[in-house]
Amino acid sequence: MHHHHHHHHHHAAGLNDIFEAQKIEWHEAAIEGRSITGISPITEYLASLSTYNDQSITFALEDESYEIYVEDLKKDEKKDKVLLSYYESQHPSNESGDGVDGKMLMVTLSPTKDFWLHANNKEHSVELHKCEKPLPDQAFFVLHNMHSNCVSFECKTDPGVFIGVKDNHLALIKVDSSENLCTENILFKLSET
C-alpha cells in the first residue's frame, strides 16, 4: 500500500524535556523582561492519553454528538492523540505544583482541530466543546507531574477537582486531601506512541 504521512504539531521532545524547557523559557523570559502569560502557549505536545491502568482514551466526535471511551484498546489499533498546549499560569499559586518559582503550568487538551476538553463543574463531567480562542477558563487544567511518569489535570475553575475515570468514563473528581493526589483514578500517562 502507498502511504504518505504528514502530521501537524509533531514534537520530538518527551514530557520531561518539556518540563525542562519550561524552566529555561521562564528563566530567559525573566532575564529579557518579556511576558509569556497565557495568551499563546509556551509549547505544544502531541501525545496519546491513557489511564494509570493503561486503558486508552478514545474520542468519538461527530458534528452533533461525541463520546469519550476509556477502554482497553485492541492490539492492532492506533491510539488517539491529544494536542496538549502548555501555558504559564497567570496567577502564581501557593500550592505545591509543577511550575517554577510558584508559577503553575496549565494545559488545554484538544483531540482534533477546534475542539477542546472542558470541565463542567455543575455536572461533574468532562465534555468536548467546539470553540474559538481565547478559550474559556473551563478548558484550562493545572498540570501536576506525579510519580511513575504520571500526570494529573486539575480544573482551573475549581481547585481540588481533577479529571478522573469513573465507570469507564472521564469525569470530574473531587480530591479532598494532598494524600489523595496519588489516587489511581486521577492519574494519566502521556505517550508519544
Epitope: H5, H6, H7, H9, S48, K74, K113
Partner: antibody, heavy 126, light 106 residues
Framework: EVQLLESGGGLVQPGGSLRLSCAAS????????MSWVRQAPGKGLEWVSG????????YYADPVKGRFTISRDNSKNTLYLQMNSLRAEDTAVYYC???????????????????WGQGTMVTVSS | SYVLTQPPSVSVSPGQTASITCSGE??????AAWYQQKPGQSPVLVIY???KRPSGIPERFSGSNSGNTATLTISGTQAMDEADYYC?????????FGGGTKLTVL
Amino acid sequence: EVQLLESGGGLVQPGGSLRLSCAASGFTFSSYAMSWVRQAPGKGLEWVSGIADDFTSTYYADPVKGRFTISRDNSKNTLYLQMNSLRAEDTAVYYCARDLWMMNYAGGLRYPFGYWGQGTMVTVSS
Amino acid sequence: SYVLTQPPSVSVSPGQTASITCSGERMGDKYAAWYQQKPGQSPVLVIYRDTKRPSGIPERFSGSNSGNTATLTISGTQAMDEADYYCGVLKQDTGVFGGGTKLTVL
C-alpha cells in the same frame, strides 16, 4: 443530514481518464477523512483510496496505486478521484464514503464508511 | 494482503436468529464493522467497533469479535433484513472488506 453526491462517471476507453467528484453537505467536511469504495457488477465491495487532511495523508489499494489520485477541496466541500490509465477491471460503481468520526491528531483513517453516497458508474470498454 | 472470509450465503426463517461470520487472521485484534446492502442501494453501516450500532439501526442487530472470527447476529430476523452483508476492517489505514454474504429470509 449527511449527504454525499457522486458524479463524473461514464463510459471510457481502456487507457483513458476520468475524474470523479463527490459533493458533501450536512456536516463539517474538512473535519472528516473520506474514502472511495467501488463495486464491480455483481461483485463485492473493494476499498480504493482514502484521504485524511488536505493532500497530506493519502492511502491507496494496490490495484490502483500509481494510476489513481485522491484529493479534496475543503473550500468546496468536495472529494475527487482522478483515474488515469483505466483498465477493464476498473469497471464498477464508485461510492464516496465518509468516516464515522472526525479526524484525530493521530492522523489517518478512523472508522471508515459511516456514510455512503449513491454511487456513480464507471465503465471501461472499447 | 489481509483477507476476510465470509460464507457466500446464509438462510433463515422469519423470527429466527441469523448469524453471519467473518474470518481473518487475528481478527479479534482489530475492530470489525458490518455493512448491509440491499439490491440497487448503497451500503449502510449496521455495526462498528465490533458491537456498536449507529443511530437508527434496530436493536436486533448485534456483533461480536474474538479470536479469528467476527460475527453479525440478527435476532428475530425480518423479511426486510434480506440483503448482502459485508464485514470490514481498517488495517494500517487501508480498508479491507469480506467477500459478502447473501442473507435469505425464507
